[in-house]
């Protein structure tokens, strides 16, 4: 749960370790100075881009170690009662389709990052949201159409996937399956929305690492 203090701290990327180090260095040099986070993250981003693979290696090692720590701690972590433990995610299960806005973000994230290289993940998301709001309804249509098509495909794929997973389902009849399907999909919707956010965060972290502008 988000509020569980016993839950292991999330794993950090190599870039996150680098930023943390930058912050510590800055604090040592300027203990009383207040930090302009926009400026600071821009400087960090620029510095990271000029670093060699060897220099980045130290932070990559830290990230690897932290990933191992996180996985180790998660194995023994027991969520508090009332919180349903996240179901095992089958990597072969059909991937939840992106929303129209998610497709729009995939299209325009490089643009925003190219024009504003120092922006934090949160600010990039904010700009994308603003850009989406500034897009006319007609221009949102292609994204909505594509999202609807992908949703349709996903629904077919997930039905086939579930049928494959339960060979006896055909004998018992489709009616029962349909009833439980609705409930299951509602649960999955909540879960997958979280996944979509997680994936976008990961993608942003990676992109922040190998941002490349002309």
């Amino acid at each position: 749960g988000k509020g569980d203090p016993k839950k292991p701290r999330g794993k950090m990327s190599s870039y996150a370790f680098f930023v943390q180090t930058c912050r510590e260095e800055h604090k040592k040099k300027h203990p009383d100075a207040s930090v302009n986070f926009s400026e600071f993250s821009k400087k960090c981003s620029e510095r990271w881009k000029t670093m060699s693979a060897k220099e980045k290696g130290k932070f990559e090692d830290m990230a690897k170690a932290d990933k191992a720590r996180y996985e180790r701690e998660m194995k023994t972590y027991i969520p508090p009662k009332g919180e349903t433990k996240k179901k095992f995610k089958d990597p072969n299960a059909p991937k939840r389709p992106p929303s129209a806005f998610f497709l729009f973000c995939s299209e325009y994230r490089p643009k925003i990052k190219g024009e504003h290289p120092g922006l934090s993940i949160g600010d990039v998301a904010k700009k994308l949201g603003e850009m989406w709001n500034n897009t006319a309804a007609d221009d949102k249509q292609p994204y909505e159409k594509k999202a609807a098509k992908l949703k349709e495909k996903y629904e077919k794929d997930i039905a086939a996937y579930r049928a494959k997973g339960k060979p006896d389902a055909a004998k018992k009849g489709v009616v029962k399956a349909e009833k439980s399907k609705k409930k299951k999909e509602e649960e999955e919707d909540e879960e997958d929305e979280e996944d979509e956010e997680e994936e976008e965060d990961e993608e942003d972290e990676e992109e922040e690492e190998d941002d490349d502008d002309e």
């Epitope: 603003e130 007609d138 594509k146």
Partner: antibody, heavy 122, light 108 residues
């Protein structure tokens, strides 16, 4: 220097085809929406088509829908307009233009090519 | 579709004079969706104003834009010889990016 350079215009018979190109330089081409805008002799400006940064989403003016196809090759920094079933009313100077998003202050075409003339006549 | 009507069609003025160009939309347009362009004979259009009132990079401050809703204005405070050209307003409110028919500013 940020630049757009159109080519491929010329004289074509009604019903014929033509492919226009627009070579971009001086900016990250793959980050921008690109447009074709045309101007008939002595007339005003009319938008023709739009393509998203990746090329995955395209838009057309009703007057060219089903006849024109916009595409791009980001590896070559080039925008294209394939024009089929050309009509006399397609005669115009065709400009490629870059769409710039100015944060909350909206959108505008900030960079234009010099244009290429397309004449449809028998 | 939103129609953009510019007036007057032609404006005959002398250098140093003030030029006021009007652009009226057939329905309300968000200010952030309105731009002005200048076009000289044989040349491509050039962006002057975006977001109804923000000057584009390199545009002299004698050019200013104002207005909201359906009525927008481009003002050139003191006409310079190089300002004699055709001016277009343009809106974006649907996927149809419509331009006005243009106002020609000519030397009197």
């Amino acid at each position: 220097e940020v630049q757009l350079l159109e080519s491929g215009g010329g004289l074509v018979q009604p019903g014929g085809s033509l492919r226009l190109s627009c070579a971009a330089s001086g900016f990250t081409f793959s980050s921008y929406d690109m447009f074709w805008v045309r101007q008939a002799p002595g007339k005003g400006l009319e938008w023709v088509s739009r393509i998203s940064p990746s090329g995955g989403y395209t838009y057309y003016a009703d007057s060219v829908k089903g006849r024109f196809t916009i595409s791009r090759d980001n590896s070559k920094n080039t925008l294209y307009l394939q024009m089929n079933s050309l009509r006399a009313e397609d005669t115009a100077v065709y400009y490629c233009a870059r769409l710039r998003y100015f944060d909350s202050r909206g959108y505008a075409f900030d960079i234009w090519g010099q244009g290429t003339m397309v004449t449809v006549s028998s | 579709d939103i129609q953009m009507t510019q007036s007057p069609g032609t404006l005959s003025l002398s250098p140093g004079e003030r030029a006021t160009l009007s652009c009226r939309a057939s329905q309300s347009v968000r200010s952030s969706y309105l731009a002005w362009y200048q076009q000289k004979p044989g040349q491509a259009p050039r962006l002057l104003i975006y977001g109804a009132s923000t000057r584009a990079t390199g545009i002299p401050d004698r050019f200013s834009g104002s207005g909201s809703g359906t009525d927008f204005t481009l003002t050139i405070s003191r006409l310079e010889p190089e300002d004699f050209a055709v001016y277009y307003c343009q809106q974006y409110g649907t996927s149809r990016w419509t331009f006005g028919q243009g106002t020609k500013v000519e030397i009197k």
